[in-house]
């Protein structure tokens, strides 16, 4: 008998800026939007108003099983993986065009679902488009090589797709991280099952409709929203999945690594937590530094794994910088409605995270740290928190050591370059880092000394799809973006011929 799944109907949504569209609400499996097998749905909330936007289907283990089966068939039974890679590139290019033609809508969906400002959302969508364009270009350019080992032999390598890829993304950059994961996987001939964060599924499902529209074959892209403990666990534990890419907390990342290894020794990419240091040297230009510090920690309401959440300032500039930082935040940085162009910072994405951040602010006060500015929520409705700066902190405080994942930063003083680097490197994390200096030699010397996957000099949280991103130490392993990511989605086969 032919398997039958109930279709999930889209809902019409009018966004706060007046744009209206049809939002898919079903699980996207085998190019169909379907209801979960048990019929369950869950509400998606607008964090700016705390209102329910719509209900979407919540995948069960059985739904994930079916998605894996469909993806498995797409990989093994169709020409997707074996066709001329230029054809995959053409489809990715069409997908980029489609996303670009709808950038206003997709940015608005992102602002509604995530709570980030419309301007920031637009930047995220732009990076997503660029990821797709890069992937389209790289699809037939990432190749093996020939190896000369002397007379009598010919040697070459081929790069082959891995197979079914499980991909789990967080709620802080829903569309951007979807593209970071899906674009290179498809370029290299893999097939994907992506679990968006339960709280931010809207753009993932809308993106799925664009995949179908441009002609990506059934089973190649599957989107399964739902709770991590069922959907995420099903992906990490299933032996048919050969590659798992996870972005999220270090704690969950460790269990993903264990489960992925125990199930079938999956290849894994982990992009995990951070407690990144932002070093400001005496010679830094304060006027240029302030926006970098703000982007470092208050961009996306601090909900960035690479956030510069520990600022270390050289003693000669410390007092001046603190005063300037306070004035800048209190006059230039507005918090509120993501659709209001005047606001730099929107809402925290969900209630749970809002409560976590407010709890950390309370912990900081109890630990004896002083508040330079902020420290309170904004308004009665929605999850808004004023940018918060703690100073007079010591390295043993929880607010200095633990990832808060919100608009909260600590500022401490250092004397020498070596001391600053030592403080920066004292964390078990190693995702991002920042250096503010007018001296190129200082910048490059310190960059070499910092234990981090990314070092930003005179900028921060500044991403480009052509530049790899990832962590060292407990911030994970593997890289996303850049040429490096394409190799993460291939297996190398060596061929040695005796002539």
């Amino acid at each position: 008998t032919k398997l039958h799944f109930d279709t999930a109907e889209p809902v019409k949504i009018t966004l706060p800026n007046g744009l209206t569209y049809e939002q898919p609400t079903g699980l996207f499996i085998n190019n169909k939007f379907m209801k979960a097998q048990d019929g369950k749905t869950y509400p998606v909330e607008d964090p700016s108003t705390e209102n329910t936007v719509c209900e979407v289907s919540s995948a069960t283990t059985e739904d994930v099983e079916y998605a894996i089966e469909c993806a498995d068939r797409a990989f093994h039974d169709t020409e997707w993986a074996t066709q001329d890679p230029r054809e995959r590139g053409r489809l990715l290019s069409k997908l980029a065009d489609e996303l670009e033609s709808q950038i206003d809508l997709v940015s608005s969906i992102e602002a509604l679902d995530n709570g980030k400002t419309l301007a920031l959302a637009r930047g995220d969508v732009t990076i997503a488009i660029n990821c797709l364009r890069d992937a389209a270009a790289y699809a037939d350019k990432v190749n093996g090589r020939t190896i000369n080992t002397g007379d009598g032999y010919m040697n070459f390598t081929t790069l082959e797709p891995i197979g079914v890829c499980g991909q789990i993304i967080p709620w802080n950059f829903p569309i951007m991280m979807l593209a970071w994961k899906i674009a290179p996987a498809l370029a290299m001939g893999n097939v994907c099952i992506l679990k968006p964060a339960a709280v931010t599924p809207l753009n993932a499902l809308y993106f799925a409709s664009l995949c179908k529209k441009v002609g990506i074959p059934a089973g190649v892209v599957n989107i399964v929203p739902g709770p991590g403990r069922t959907v995420g666990a099903a992906l990490t534990n299933d032996p048919r999945i050969r590659k798992l890419a996870f972005t999220g907390s270090t704690e969950v990342g460790k269990s993903v690594a264990v489960d992925s290894s125990e199930s079938n020794l999956k290849k894994i990419t982990l992009e995990l937590g951070g407690k990144s240091a932002h070093l400001v040297f005496d010679d830094a230009n304060i006027k240029k530094t302030l926006p970098n510090l703000v982007n470092g920690i208050f961009k996306n309401a601090g909900q960035i794994c690479s956030s510069g959440s520990r600022i270390y300032v050289q003693e000669g500039i410390y007092d001046e910088l603190l005063a300037a930082f306070k004035a800048y935040l209190e006059t230039e940085i507005k918090v509120g409605n993501p659709f209001d162009k005047a606001n730099f910072q929107g809402a925290i994405t969900n209630r749970q995270q809002f409560d976590t951040i407010m709890n950390y602010i309370d912990i900081g006060k109890k630990e004896g740290a002083k508040i330079l500015t902020g420290g309170e929520k904004v308004g009665d409705k929605g999850y808004f928190i004023r940018p918060t700066v703690f100073y007079d902190v010591n390295e043993d405080m929880r607010i200095v050591k633990e990832e808060i994942f919100g608009p909260v930063v600590t500022v401490a003083k250092f004397k020498t370059l070596e001391e600053g680097v030592e403080m920066a490197n004292s964390s078990e994390f190693g995702l991002g880092s920042g250096i503010e200096t007018e001296s190129l030699s200082t910048g490059l010397k310190v960059a070499k000394m910092l234990k981090a996957g990314t070092v930003w000099i005179n900028t921060y949280n500044d991403f480009d799809s052509r530049v790899p991103f990832g962590g060292v130490k407990q911030s994970g392993y593997g890289r996303e973006m850049g040429e490096e990511v394409y190799h993460a989605y291939t297996e190398v086969k060596a061929v040695r011929i005796k002539l």
Epitope: T1, K2, L3, E69, D72, R73, H76, D77
Partner: nanobody, 111 residues
Framework: QVQLVESGGGLVQPGDSLRLSCAAS????????MTWVRQAPGKGLEWVST???????TYANSVKGRFTISRDNAKNTLYLQMNNLKPEDTAVYYC?????RGQGTQVTVSS
């Protein structure tokens, strides 16, 4: 019209063996990735094993080392050899491919 017909189930004791068959018509087993799934009483559907069109096989960790999936291209039939059966293997077993699934065959393991 596609038809998948499972057979070979039955009541056996723990430690015994069974061989399930899945005869396909209107559908070529060798060019399609084929799976065995099972549903235990009161539980959801659980994947058991896959035989790929390209020839490879994969097994759920719960059955690895005990079950073997195979196919006979000439007979257009998929098989599941189940050894060292355990009470927790009790379920209705279904074979499937390309969005089709058979009616299932009952396997009961009990002493």
């Amino acid at each position: 019209q596609v038809q998948l017909v499972e057979s070979g189930g039955g009541l056996v004791q723990p430690g015994d063996s069974l061989r399930l068959s899945c005869a396909a018509s209107g559908f070529t087993v060798s060019t399609n990735t084929m799976t065995w799934v099972r549903q235990a009483p009161g539980k959801g559907l659980e994947w058991v094993s896959t035989k790929y069109s390209t020839g490879g096989t994969t097994y759920a960790n719960s059955v690895k080392g005990r079950f073997t999936i195979s196919r006979d291209n000439a007979k257009n039939t998929l098989y599941l050899q189940m050894n060292n059966l355990k009470p927790e293997d009790t379920a209705v077993y279904y074979c499937g491919g390309a969005d089709y699934r058979g009616q299932g065959t009952q396997v009961t393991v009990s002493s």
